[in-house]
């Protein structure tokens, strides 16, 4: 038979048991609070670093684009695509209609200073979007030129010139001295491209990739 415990020993065991219970409770609470802290701090740090990255990215553009208009991309609140205000956006690009009259080279330099190029038109849809913002009685330089006068047309961003995706007015291009392309409106054919002299001042269209932040 097991000998009965002394009252003193019983108290000692109870105290030890209580200590173990309290220790486990404290450890559990500590673990829970660590888990809670971690679950709060990690996203906070993640959000903080993302914000810092965004701010530094915005600072890059601030010199030429003090104001950006941004829209949420998809369902993810983290991803925004922006265009400088008051540029317009279409698909993955931003567009700016420059109403100052400048030569082709100066127009390209002007776009370049803003982190853009004279517009490269890749599809009919893109042209249809662009013409919504143009005035019918004006002509606008495109990022398309033939500096050698040999009908080797080239886009400013080195996109290959594809004869199948061109929108020349009928009979154009028609002059080897006219080495730069404009988009303009002809009542008979609506909007299309024409070759003109590069040194003659025209309005222009700049295009840049959207800014993702």
């Amino acid at each position: 038979m097991v000998p009965e415990e002394e009252p003193q020993d019983r108290e000692k065991g109870l105290w030890w048991f209580q200590l173990k219970v309290w220790s486990m409770a404290v450890v559990s609470i500590l673990l829970l609070s660590v888990c809670f802290t971690v679950s709060s701090v990690v996203p906070h740090n993640f959000m903080y670093s993302k914000t810092v990255k965004r701010l530094s990215k915005l600072r890059e553009y601030q010199q030429y684009h003090p104001s950006l208009t941004c829209v949420m991309e998809g369902k993810d609140i983290e991803d925004w695509s922006c265009c400088p205000t008051p540029w317009t956006s279409f698909q993955s690009s931003c567009y700016f209609i420059s109403t100052g009259m400048q030569s082709w080279t100066k127009s390209q330099k002007n776009c370049s200073v803003m982190g853009a190029d004279l517009v490269v038109i890749n599809t009919r849809e893109e042209q249809d979007f662009i013409i919504q913002n143009l005035k019918r009685n004006s002509s606008y330089f495109l990022g398309l030129s033939d500096p050698g006068g040999r009908r080797h047309w080239q886009w400013v961003d080195q996109t290959p010139y594809n004869e199948n995706v061109t929108f020349w007015h009928s009979g154009e291009p028609n002059n080897l001295d006219e080495r730069c392309a404009i988009i303009n409106f002809r009542s008979s054919e609506e909007w299309g491209w024409n070759d003109i002299h590069c040194h003659v001042p025209q309005k222009s269209i700049c295009k840049m990739k959207k800014i993702y932040i």
Epitope: Q102, K106, P147, H199
Partner: antibody
Framework: EVQLVESGGGLVKPGGSLRLSCAAS????????MSWVRQAPGKGLEWVAT????????YYPDSVKGRFTISRDNAKNSLYLQMNSLRAEDTAVYYC??????????????WGQGTTVTVSS | DIVLTQSPASLAVSPGQRATITCRAS??????????MHWYQQKPGQPPKLLIY???NLESGVPARFSGSGSETDFTLTINPVEANDAANYYC?????????FGGGTKVEIK
């Protein structure tokens, strides 16, 4: 041999008109842009007007815009400058020059001997 | 308009020496390695004659004593060695944009 021969200069009163001509030979006139450049007595060169080869574009500096008109007749190998509302400051030797395009610009590779226009009362 | 400033306005050079004329543009006349600055010679009572096109290209029939250099806004016409029949006015001209403009000219006299 490329030749450009101007004619039509003379003495005219302020507010009067003159028409200058430039006869071109020795090259395919219709393939080249052409310009008029003038030089006031003892002064430098000043561009006055340009017409593209296909006759589709004409350009003028502000100093003559609305008063001078450049035109061409490719069938006659001739370039013209109609000058109206003439002023004393239009007094100069007027040169006809052929433009040769290079890259995004051009230069004047042949010049005529010039014709003198004097505007005086 | 692009303003072209030539210097000096005049210079006197001995035959066999080098003459250097500079032309400064109020803004760049270069684009992607092409420099749209040209030089002309004009002798008294004659029309201008093309010497150099696109900054450094010698026009056909022009003696190799004439040379051009420069880019962006600063251009130079050099005559080396100078000969007696080089006495003339020399003009620079830009064509990167309308209106095409000329420098004020440099008068070269032979000592």
């Amino acid at each position: 041999e490329v030749q450009l021969v101007e004619s039509g200069g003379g003495l005219v009163k302020p507010g009067g008109s003159l028409r200058l001509s430039c006869a071109a030979s020795g090259f395919t006139f219709s393939s080249y842009g052409m310009s008029w450049v003038r030089q006031a007595p003892g002064k430098g060169l000043e561009w006055v007007a340009t017409i593209s080869s296909g006759d589709s574009y004409t350009y003028y500096p502000d100093s003559v815009k609305g008063r001078f008109t450049i035109s061409r007749d490719n069938a006659k190998n001739s370039l013209y400058l109609q000058m109206n509302s003439l002023r004393a400051e239009d007094t100069a030797v007027y040169y006809c020059a052929r433009q040769l395009y290079y890259s995004y610009g051009y230069y004047f590779d042949y010049w005529g001997q010039g014709t003198t226009v004097t505007v005086s009362s | 308009d692009i303003v072209l400033t030539q210097s000096p306005a005049s210079l006197a050079v001995s035959p066999g020496q080098r003459a250097t004329i500079t032309c400064r543009a109020s803004e760049s006349v270069s684009f992607h390695g092409t420099h749209l600055m040209h030089w002309y010679q004009q002798k008294p009572g004659q029309p201008p004659k093309l010497l150099i096109y696109a900054a450094s290209n010698l026009e056909s029939g022009v003696p190799a004593r004439f040379s051009g250099s420069g880019s962006e806004t600063d251009f130079t016409l050099t005559i080396n060695p100078v000969e007696a029949n080089d006495a003339a006015n020399y003009y620079c001209q830009q064509s990167i944009e309308d209106p095409p403009t000329f420098g004020g000219g440099t008068k070269v006299e032979i000592k």
